[in-house]
């Protein structure tokens, strides 16, 4: 008896009520493996989540966010809310970037900004909320005498740029 | 803060209907991503989760109550309604209401819930 | 519709205590299961949600695990005001409770 039910294909599920023929999902669920005695129901891409892939008798369906939030854990279990680059999400929102921090994606924390010395460079742009510094060559490097194909492009004021 | 106060429990008569309120303050029941819902619990008994209606005016309904219940709000009140009819003395329990998610990161979990409502259903 | 069976369906024991209480889903649900804690008179609390995640404000002596079909809710060191009851409850497909695990003093 077994055997019968180990030829049912994926999409179908083996019925015990009758005779173990192979019957199809009900709509709404699916069996992604052949042998299968149920069919599991669908996730369901419900309030905050919206459908990404809708489920097939051989595949569940796939969820995303809606607009203004993205997914988080497995399989996209939670949606969180996005912010402006140059900001970071905590308990009580979208918070702007500490001075010396910056985020450049809507999502993630602020880090800090590169720190050009550890590495023998010195600052050619300044960070911003947004952006992280751009480290150009070493002091040394732009002492007088030495070339430099480019000069250095004018430095913004840190921490401050166009909200 | 997010508040969200039930009223409308009582002494009902079998066969009757009530209609429920659950006034939400700290919070719009329009901002999307939020879904607001009814939960229930019978003295001594689990949690039944009712109904749940969303931001874009999505409605979910619990199968077995599906035919009896009617989930709806007024944006303009902030505030949000189940009417249930054909009231059997099963009916009998304390009615929650309750906010999916959390405050930043939101799925199917209740955050947020008001202190119930009692109804008794009773001749 | 998708059934939760949480067990035991009471327990006791006392503070200082490890508790684990576990709650099985009819199918797979994947991570999609949040634990309450109730106490008599009140509205239920969330303690954990997404399977694993605590709660803001909640003491990390309450953790959350499992995935699919198997969870498990642990207090690792039972304190006087954890006794209660707890409820899982499953967001996969509509949303659905176990009917609870009662907590009580030995």
């Known amino acids: 008896l077994q055997d019968l039910c180990s030829n049912c294909p994926a999409g179908t599920f083996c019925d015990n009520n009758r005779s173990q023929i192979c019957s199809p999902c009900p709509p709404n669920s699916f069996s992604s493996a052949g042998g299968q005695r149920t069919c599991d129901i669908c996730r369901q891409c419900k309030g905050v989540f919206k459908t990404r892939k809708e489920c097939s008798s051989t595949s569940n369906a796939e969820c995303d966010c809606i607009s203004g939030y993205h997914c988080l854990g497995a399989e996209c279990s939670m949606c969180e809310q996005d912010c402006k680059q140059g900001q970071e999400l905590t308990k009580k929102g979208c918070k702007d970037c500490c001075f010396g921090t910056f985020n450049d994606q809507k999502r993630g924390i602020c880090r800090p900004w590169t720190n050009c010395s550890l590495d023998g460079k010195s600052v050619l742009v300044n960070g911003t909320k947004e952006r992280d510094v751009v480290c150009g060559p070493s002091p040394a490097d732009l002492s007088p005498g030495a070339s430099s194909a480019t000069p250095p492009a004018p430095a913004r004021e840190p921490g401050h740029s166009p909200q | 803060e997010v508040q969200l106060v039930e009223s409308g429990g009582g002494l009902v008569q079998p066969g009757g209907s009530l209609r429920l309120s659950c006034a939400a303050s700290g919070f719009s029941l329009s901002t999307g991503g939020v879904g607001v819902g009814w939960i229930r619990q019978a003295p001594g008994k689990c949690l039944e989760w009712l109904a749940l209606i969303d931001w874009a005016d999505d409605k979910y309904y619990s199968p077995s109550l599906k035919s009896r219940l009617t989930i709806s709000r007024d944006n303009s009140k902030n505030t949000l309604y189940l009417q249930l009819n054909s009231l059997r003395a099963e009916d009998t329990a304390v009615y929650y209401c309750?906010?999916?998610?959390?405050?930043?990161?939101?799925?199917?979990?209740?955050?947020?819930w008001g202190q119930g409502t009692l109804v008794t259903v009773s001749s | 519709d998708i059934q939760l069976t949480q067990s035991p369906s009471s327990l006791s024991a006392s503070v200082g205590d490890r508790v684990t209480i576990t709650c099985r889903a009819s199918q797979s649900i994947g991570s999609y299961l949040a634990w309450y804690q109730q106490k008599p008179g009140k509205a239920p609390k969330l303690l954990i949600y997404d399977a694993s995640n605590l709660e803001t404000g909640v003491p990390s002596r309450f953790s959350g695990s499992g995935s699919g079909t198997d969870f498990t809710l642990t207090i690792s060191s039972l304190q006087p005001e954890d006794f209660a009851t707890y409820y899982c409850q499953q967001g996969y497909y509509l949303w659905t409770f176990g009917c609870g695990t009662k907590v009580e003093i030995k």
């Open positions: 309750a906010r999916g998610g959390s405050d930043t990161v939101i799925g199917d979990w209740f955050a947020y």
